[in-house]
Structures are given as C-alpha cells and as structure tokens.
C-alpha cells in the first residue's frame, strides 16, 4: 500500500518582504526520499523543478529556489509540491512574496524573517488546480538554469 505523503512546507529566506533588486530563496521541505521538488506560482503557467534535494534533518529533505535580483514581477503567491516515487504530494499552502521599493539598496536588512507556509489547512483555492504556476527568474541553487519570461 502506498504511503500517505505529508504536505510540503514553503518558506522564504531572508523573508517574504524583499527590497527591489535583492535576492530571495524559497525553501521547500518534505519527507526524506523526495526525488523532485517543484515550485509553482499562482496564476502563472511557468514552474521550476529541481532534483537537487538535500537532507535538512533525519526526517526532512529540502530544496532551494533562488531569485538573484527580485523585480516587481516576482511578487505574488508561491507554493511547493514534491514527487516521492511513485506519486506526487499535495501542494503546500501559498506563500506570498512582497516586493517593495527601497532607498536602502540591495543589502538593506529591511525584510521580514522567518516567513513560511506549513502543512496546515488545505489551500483555499481549488486544490485540483495543481499548477497555477511558478516564476520568472527562478533557479534551484547551484544548478537550475535562469528562466526569463516576458
């Protein structure tokens, strides 16, 4: 019998309020044994996959998706889903990325730390909409190529 897969969680480092031009990393977490993490973005047809999965703890694996220079177009809700053979998990809750103009420059520490969306209640959107997707300029750290969409 197939195991019941826990829903993934999603968080953002250094936070969910990011100054224009700064970097942000989405961290997707799931159980050990995950083969692929996918980052999707609400109302977008794009998505990002990575098989660069690391072990975050004895019971958890994670993948990281980095945007090097955040633009206004990167703002919006993001979510994760993962593939642990032989099936996909449910989606995580959405995590909203806010991009704000700042005079402090890219290194300004003007962010909200520790923001995350864990495997709590079901998403409020249609949970069968398994791809309302992902983002411009995203890459899995160390390996994912840079997408550019107009």
């Amino acid at each position: 019998q197939e195991e019941d897969l826990p829903r993934p969680s999603i968080s953002a480092e250094p936070g969910t309020v990011i100054p224009l031009g700064s970097h942000v990393t989405f961290v997707c977490r799931g159980p050990v044994g995950v083969q692929t993490f996918r980052l999707e973005r609400e109302s977008r047809s794009t998505y990002n996959d990575t098989e660069d999965v690391s072990q975050a703890s004895p019971s958890e694996s994670e993948a990281r998706f980095r945007i090097d220079s955040v633009s206004e177009g990167n703002a919006g809700p993001y979510r994760c889903i993962y593939y642990k053979p032989p099936k996909w998990s449910e989606q995580s809750d959405y995590l909203e990325l806010l991009v704000k103009e700042t005079s402090g420059g890219p290194d300004s520490p003007d962010t909200e730390p520790g923001s995350s969306a864990g495997p709590t209640q079901r998403p409020s959107d249609n949970s069968h909409n398994e791809h309302a997707p992902a983002s411009q300029g995203l890459k899995a750290e160390h390996l994912y190529h840079h997408h550019h969409h107009h």
Partner: antibody, heavy 116, light 110 residues
Amino acid sequence: AAVKESGGRLVTPGTPLTLTCTASGFSLYKYNIQWVRQAPGKGLEYIGASTYAGYTYYASWAKGRVTISRTSTTVDLKMTSPTTEDTATYFCARHIDGDYSGYALWGPGTLVTVSS
Amino acid sequence: ELVLTQTPASVSAAVGGTVTIKCQASQSIGTWFAWYQQKPGQSPKLLIYGASNLASGVSSRFKGIRSGTEYTLTISDLECADAATYYCQCSDVGNTYGAAFGGGTEVEIN
C-alpha cells in the same frame, strides 16, 4: 524525447476503443499529457488531459464519453461508446519544460474511423 | 465554459507582408495561452507559449502579444512556408480557467 499514439482502427458504433500514448526519452511523471482530436478537414478539438500530479481533466463535451488514465510510461484514452462523429485523427502531446501552457511534443496521430 | 474566439477564419497575404490573427478569450486566462501552426497531414507545431514567449527553434518573425483577454499573433516578413492553419489554445487543466482551442485561421500566401 517523443510521444506516439497507437490503437486507432476501424470500429463499429458503440464498440469501446482504447488509444495509448507512449512516452519515450523522458520521465512522464513530470508532465501533463493532453489528448486532442481532428476530424477530417476540421480544426483541433480539445478532449482532455492527464496531469503530472495524477488528476484528469475533460472538455465538457467529453465527460462520460471518454476516460483518461496513466501508467508510468503511457497515457490511455478510452472511448466508451464511439459514434460516427468520433471519426478523427487523435493526437497526444506533452508540454515543454518549465511552462505548462505550451505543448511542443506531439505524436504523429492515430486515425479512428467509426462506421457501420 | 471557456471559449476562444479566433479571427479571421482565413486570410490571404503577399510574400513579405504581415498577417495578424486575434484570439479573444471569454474570461481572463493569464499566461495559460499558446499559438500553434499546422500544415496539412502534419501534427501541430508550437510557436508561442505563455502568451508571448517564442518556442525553441521558431523564427522571430512570429510574435505573440497579450492585452487583457485578447491575444494576438503577428507574422511579419511572410514566407511561402508560412502557409498553414494557425490555432490558439488555453491549456489550464487545473480547472481554474479550463482548456480549449480557437477555431483556427487559414493563412494563404499569394
């Protein structure tokens, strides 16, 4: 990477028929596969899809008339009770990497003829 | 139910000219939109995805533009090889928008 349809043939009305889309050279689990048909001399008509996460989606006209299912290497389209109006070339297609909206990988199609 | 209304049904243009094809969606579908080219006896070929992104290997003479719920495909510097039928498609199969094809536009080069 390629997809290829098979199973098309001449059947009489009401005879169930299963078409198979076989994936090669890529991991099917990552992709949505859509089924599309084209009657002779007509335009493309959307039938439905099997999503990467295991859901199925049907055009409203196709609900109850077809069933889509998948294995690790194939996506099947079962026509439960075909009529002469179902005579068409049936295509399956896979979307591109990184974007669900564009289907760049299409099979050559398989011809289904429904006639008494 | 999502409906894509594609116009015109057919168009004729000269080599070197420009053709514009429009697709009007019955609801907002965002970037869940693509354009295809199909020649007789062949499978469809992806031209534009995500409403405005050029597919790999496709000439930059093809351009996709989105304005609200109206999508436009422009083919410039027409060549004889552009004679084909062109289709628009929305393919959000997650039940938010739905999936459908436009009725097609036959492009004749004279």
